[in-house]
């Protein structure tokens, strides 16, 4: 018979022969022959292969370097790599998470729209009319101006996006 030019899924062509690929978590030790199956070996501790493969070496698990602010989010297995994230207060610079960025704070006049996570930064929004923020914070939303009326007071000083209104007593009409 003609030697194959293509092989089935999870097989590879070598020496005019279709051999089985090694399953995830295992590496290739020796190719199959006319008489023997492909020989595979499990990856060692701290190694992985995440696809059907013919690799002779497993990949090292990613190291989450604490000196870069990284920590393990999910421990690797023989079939999956370790997933890193950043320590509290910081987030990954990129999807690869090889370094960390300090969460930004929202300046006075801005409030937190979305609190930062291990993979995304703080999202700030300007305080709309009727709201203010007088602090730089990574957590605080814009606060509504104090309602003087509900306290039976009047506005003595208008609020801004950075300051609350100042309430004062109503002027009593003299008889």
């Amino acid at each position: 018979p003609e030697p194959p030019t293509a092989c089935r899924e999870k097989q590879y062509l070598i020496n005019s022969q279709c051999c089985s690929l090694c399953q995830p978590g295992q590496k290739l030790v020796s190719d199959c022959t006319e008489f023997t199956e492909t020989e595979c070996l499990p990856c060692g501790e701290s190694e992985f292969l995440d696809t059907w493969n013919r690799e002779t070496h497993c990949h090292q698990h990613k190291y989450c370097d604490p000196n870069l602010g990284l920590r393990v989010q999910q421990k690797g297995t023989s079939e999956t790599d370790t997933i890193c994230t950043c320590e509290e207060g910081w987030h990954c610079t990129s999807e690869a998470c090889e370094s960390c960025v300090l969460h930004r704070s929202c300046s006075p006049g801005f409030g937190v729209k979305q609190i930062a996570t291990g993979v995304s930064d703080t999202i700030c929004e300007p305080c709309p009319v009727g709201f203010f923020s007088n602090v730089s914070s990574a957590f605080e939303k814009c606060h509504p101006w104090t309602s003087c009326e509900t306290k039976d007071l009047v506005v003595q000083q208008a609020g801004t996006n950075k300051t609350d209104v100042v309430c004062g007593p109503q002027d009593r009409l003299r008889a």
């Epitope: 610079t93 090889e98 960025v101 704070s105």
Partner: antibody, heavy 116, light 112 residues
């Protein structure tokens, strides 16, 4: 080997703008933030802001917020810092620095002189 | 903004003698995650700054072990056990607890 190579010295007139470049090599550009720090003659170090090249997300020191723009070009692994409305007090050496373990790699510095 | 204050501003030292630089922050740099975000840099004459110590006490790669960093939340010390001629330059502390990142004024170490 990680390297940050900055553009050459500039002499600018008050009121004009300057754009300094910082070309990175020897690492994955999008994996680390790039910061800008300046040093006026005989003075200390002053942080201006950074760019995250992965997200193109900048963060500025409020002191410079209305005058500084930090950008990054992923295709050339280059970060840029543009400072506008220049005044004599902006005469300084401007450094780019990568944030990893710390500011672990620095550019050689770009001298910007503002003079009429 | 967090204010970083260094002392002394000038430090003449005899080679072989110890040296100590103090840095004080206006706010504790100890984060709730347990890390202290205080960094030390050295700027040698005519050069860009280089990092010496990160997170208060960890020595950067290639930095001689005669350097050490210590401190609490607001008071920090950089020590050189035996000063050598190559240690001359300006030493800066910096906080990275919050933006804007701020540096101390610098301490100029010179050889007597």
């Amino acid at each position: 080997e990680v390297q940050l190579v900055q553009s050459g010295a500039e002499v600018k007139k008050p009121g004009s703008s300057v754009k300094v470049s910082c070309k990175a090599s020897g690492y994955t550009f999008t994996s680390y933030t790039m910061h800008w720090v300046r040093q006026a003659p005989g003075q200390g170090l002053e942080w201006m802001g950074y760019i995250n090249p992965s997200s193109d997300y900048p963060n500025y020191n409020q002191k410079f917020k209305d005058r500084v723009t930090i950008t990054a070009d992923k295709s050339t692994s280059t970060a840029y810092m543009e400072l506008s409305s220049l005044r004599s007090e902006d005469t300084a050496v401007y450094y780019c620095a990568r944030w990893g373990y710390s500011f672990d790699y620095w550019g050689q510095g770009t001298t910007v002189t503002v003079s009429s | 903004d967090i204010v970083m204050t260094q002392s002394p501003l000038s430090l003449p030292v005899t080679p072989g003698e110890p040296a100590s630089i103090s840095c004080r922050s206006s706010k504790s740099l100890l984060h709730s995650n347990g890390n202290t975000y205080l960094y030390w840099y050295l700027q040698k004459p005519g050069q860009s700054p280089q990092y010496l110590i990160y997170r208060m006490s960890t020595l950067a790669s290639g930095v001689p072990d005669r350097f050490s960093g210590s401190g609490s939340g607001t008071d920090f010390t950089l020590k050189i056990s035996r000063v050598e001629a190559e240690d001359v330059g300006v030493y800066y502390c910096m906080q990275h607890l919050e933006y804007p990142l701020t540096f101390g004024q610098g301490t100029k170490l010179e050889i007597k």
